[in-house]
């Protein structure tokens, strides 16, 4: 999916809003320090493509976030400010509901969390340059 | 332009009724949501209730439950709040809001229908004063 066509302002308000929230709620108990950030990004739609990669496919060691309430909240933002994104969704949801596993929060887990904690804000600073 | 201009505010005693419209022009009503907001002094604002003009889809807050009803006439452009069995805490200013997006995605609306920044189109609001 291309992101360019999506409404950023809206979307960058919806996680201001609470999705932001729901990432901290997730990583509570971890320090801020713990992991590194090795992902990154460099403009809103190649953010964004970032942030649903890592949020929506599974990793080594990290099988599924996506019934994780942040991840509920990012698919449903992106459903409605990125016209089409809903359609090309469809054979992902159905393939991942074939796969899905119980719900286990691991170090792993974690640290990809983090990672998208680090997306999200360079999506929320897109004129910053790139380091 | 788009406007949004609400009314039907005013005082009533607590157990009592009100009916708010808000009469929105500007812009294609069958694909926006629309919600109430309401703003008590010293307060944030909060979402009240949910439309969407697409399907008829509502959201309510769990403090307004049971007591208000949300409802819309595209016809006429216009929505409504019928409030029943008002209480002296929902003294407030009463604003309308639009969306150009949610309208047309109901169900996923529900993580964010109560968040004020979501919003493209405001109305001036109307004074709603329950008196114990």
């Known amino acids: 999916y291309d992101f360019t066509n999506c409404d950023f302002e809206k979307i960058k308000a919806a996680y201001l809003s609470t999705i932001s929230k729901d990432l901290i709620t997730y990583m509570s108990g971890t320090k801020s320090t713990e992991f590194n950030n090795t992902v990154s990004c460099s403009n809103r739609p190649h953010c964004l493509t970032e942030i649903q990669s890592l949020t929506f496919n599974p990793t080594a060691g990290c099988a599924s976030l996506a019934k994780e309430m942040f991840a509920m909240k990012t698919k449903a933002a992106l459903a409605i400010w990125c016209p089409g994104y809903s359609e090309t969704q469809i054979n992902a949801t159905q393939a991942m509901k074939k796969r899905r596993k119980r719900k286990v929060t691991t170090n792993k887990c974690l640290e990809q969390v983090s990672q998208l904690q680090g997306l999200w804000r360079r999506f929320n600073r897109p004129l910053l340059k790139q380091q | 332009q788009v406007q949004l201009v609400e009314s039907g505010g005013g005082l009533v005693q607590a157990g009592g009724s009100l009916r708010l419209s808000c009469a929105a022009s500007?812009?294609?009503?069958?694909?926006?949501?629309i919600t109430w907001f309401r703003q008590a002094p010293g307060k944030e604002r909060e979402g009240v209730s949910y439309?969407?003009?697409?399907?008829?889809?509502?959201y309510y807050a769990d403090s307004v439950k049971g007591r208000f009803t949300i409802s819309s006439d595209n016809a006429k452009n216009t929505v409504y709040l019928q409030m029943d069995s008002l209480k002296p805490e929902d003294t407030a200013v009463y604003y309308c809001a639009a969306e150009g997006r949610m309208g047309t995605h109901s169900r996923e609306s529900s993580y964010f229908w109560t968040f004020p920044a979501l919003y493209d189109y405001w109305g001036q609001g109307t004074q709603v004063t329950v008196s114990s």
């Open positions: 439309i969407s003009n697409n399907d008829h889809n509502t």
């Open positions: 500007g812009f294609t009503f069958d694909d926006y949501a």
